[in-house]
């Protein structure tokens, strides 16, 4: 259950960015679609977007749209949404016209005279805003994701391109490129641009190389960059770590598996608030970290970083953050103490030396000092204690 | 039921103007975004032109555009296109047409048809 953003760090995503310079393509974006390659049509009116009118919709202004896209052609016709039925005349004569309110409501439509973009023009007011949308699914569904990372948020870069997934090279990788990948997926922003072999390497095609991000770019594909052909190998696949990205640690115990409960989330190290910390989320943790399962949770300490985060699981949940959580932004944890625990693979328990981390666990570093891009395009520097 | 008249057709040597008017019965004509389309013999129907409710938005056609422009006054119920640099390609039966849900680009979305005039462009 992903927490909204607080006010200074705004969850952004496609739908905040423009495609295009003014008059250099289509002013038109795709929303609430299974990728950026399909959805609800928006044309860009000034300073908003508006829903693109069904009934002018067409298969010339669809195949406009995916190729504007970079989406490859439009799927076939009776994939679209099909014709919108002509509309009650409205009241006898006689009655109070609605030609201004219809013309303030009127939705606007993309018209166009033949399959390419240039051929086209937004049109406002050219429809009755009767609910009716341009939707449409184009042939190359071009999608983004981070993998082995222990989230959605964190781990090797993957593209979807001609029907498979595949990575991107690490070469000239920063975190501009990160972030246009973070702020894509919906994950913040980028805490972390990583090099090869901080992830499991990836298998399919290398489908970019050399990309290089203004940090401004709606889609990774908006990036400059090569094809991902010759001069790469898994090794270099480059991966990223995301400001909604959660891993945790235990610390101020007698190792790894003991001690006070933190989060890194959001580019800082916060405590967990005790007062809903139960055994199942406990356990959760403790199995999380390769740690066993949870044996004890001692009193917790007054919160000695920023407490703000909340878990509730069932005991099932492979990590804490497939739990139900939420992160409270404005408040610390009100009236209780840090979460702390204490796992059966503790040495304090078992007087062992420390335990290796299981390899079916994967971990990301944070390393003690990342530049953290914010979305105004400054850099701070945090010291991560 | 909307009535849809055109005028204003007729026989016009290439390079020419002609202005074709289409009075409508509706008293709601303000109502309705209005259009023209042609047929040229042996041709099948093709959009010329549309406007919205109150005119403040226009579409043309490729072919017409830069030589045609479409307008309405909605206190005389009218609808004007002004034919400028008339082509032979130009000839044909150009119609009126009325649309209450969208601008009449489409034939689909099309309410109400006029009868249609004649224009021909012809040395």
């Known amino acids: 259950h992903p927490s909204p953003a607080p006010p200074d760090q705004l969850n952004t995503s496609s739908a905040e960015s423009e495609l295009w310079e003014p008059g250099e393509r289509l002013p038109v974006r795709l929303t609430n679609g299974s990728s950026s390659c399909s959805g609800t049509v928006e044309v860009r009116l000034e300073a908003s977007w508006e829903p693109a009118c069904g009934a002018l919709w067409d298969s010339r202004a669809a195949e406009a749209v995916c190729r504007a896209l970079g989406c490859g052609g439009a799927e076939a016709a009776s994939q679209l949404a099909p014709p919108t039925p002509e509309l009650p005349p409205p009241p006898a004569a006689g009655n109070t016209s609605v030609a201004a309110n219809a013309t303030l409501a009127g939705a606007p439509a993309l018209l166009c005279s033949g399959a390419e973009w240039r051929l086209c023009e937004v049109v406002e007011h050219a429809c009755r805003s009767d609910g009716r949308r341009a939707r449409v699914t184009c042939a190359e569904n071009r999608a983004l994701r981070l993998v082995d990372g222990g989230g959605a948020c964190a781990g090797r870069v993957e593209m979807l391109e001609h029907g498979e997934w595949g990575s991107v090279c690490d070469d000239t990788w920063d975190l501009e490129d990160a972030h246009v990948v973070c702020r894509q997926l919906g994950c913040g922003w980028a805490v972390q641009a990583l090099p090869g072999l901080h992830f499991t390497p990836g298998r399919g095609p290398i489908h970019r190389d050399q990309v290089n991000c203004s940090g401004a770019e709606a889609y990774l594909w908006d990036c400059p960059g090569l094809p991902g052909q010759h001069y790469c190998g898994h090794k270099e696949d480059a991966g990223a770590v995301c400001s909604e990205h959660q891993s945790w640690r235990l610390t101020g115990g007698a190792d790894r598996c003991e001690g006070q409960v933190e989060v890194h989330f959001r580019g800082v190290w916060n405590t967990v608030c005790d007062s809903e910390w139960y055994p199942s989320e406990a356990k959760v943790l403790c199995q999380s970290l390769g740690c066993g399962t949870a044996v004890e949770r001692p009193k917790g300490l007054p919160h000695s970083l920023s407490g703000r985060m909340y878990y509730s699981c069932n005991g099932e949940e492979l990590t804490l953050s497939n739990c139900s959580w939420r992160f409270n932004n404005s408040n610390l944890c009100s009236q209780s103490l840090a979460a702390r625990v204490l796992c059966s693979a503790s040495r304090s328990l078992h007087n062992l030396s420390t335990p290796e981390v299981p390899a079916s666990v994967q971990t990301v570093t944070i390393e003690s000092s990342v530049t953290v891009k914010i979305e105004n395009k400054e850099s701070r520097e945090l010291m991560l204690l | 039921q909307v009535q849809l008249v055109e005028s204003g057709g007729g026989l016009v040597q290439p390079g020419g103007s002609l202005r074709l008017s289409c009075s409508a019965s509706?008293?709601?004509?303000?109502?309705?975004?209005m259009g023209w389309f042609r047929q040229a013999p042996g041709k099948e129907r093709e959009f010329v032109s549309a406007?919205?409710?109150?005119?403040?938005?226009?579409y043309y056609a490729d072919s017409v555009k830069g030589r045609f422009t479409i307008s309405r006054d909605n206190s005389k119920n009218t609808l004007y296109l002004q034919m400028n640099s008339l082509r032979a390609e130009d000839t044909a039966v150009y119609y009126c047409v009325a649309s209450w849900g969208a601008m009449p680009v489409l034939t689909h979305v099309i309410n109400y048809w006029g009868q249609g005039t004649l224009v021909t462009v012809s040395s």
């Open positions: 509706e008293r709601t004509f303000s109502d309705y975004a």
């Open positions: 406007i919205n409710w109150v005119g403040g938005s226009t």
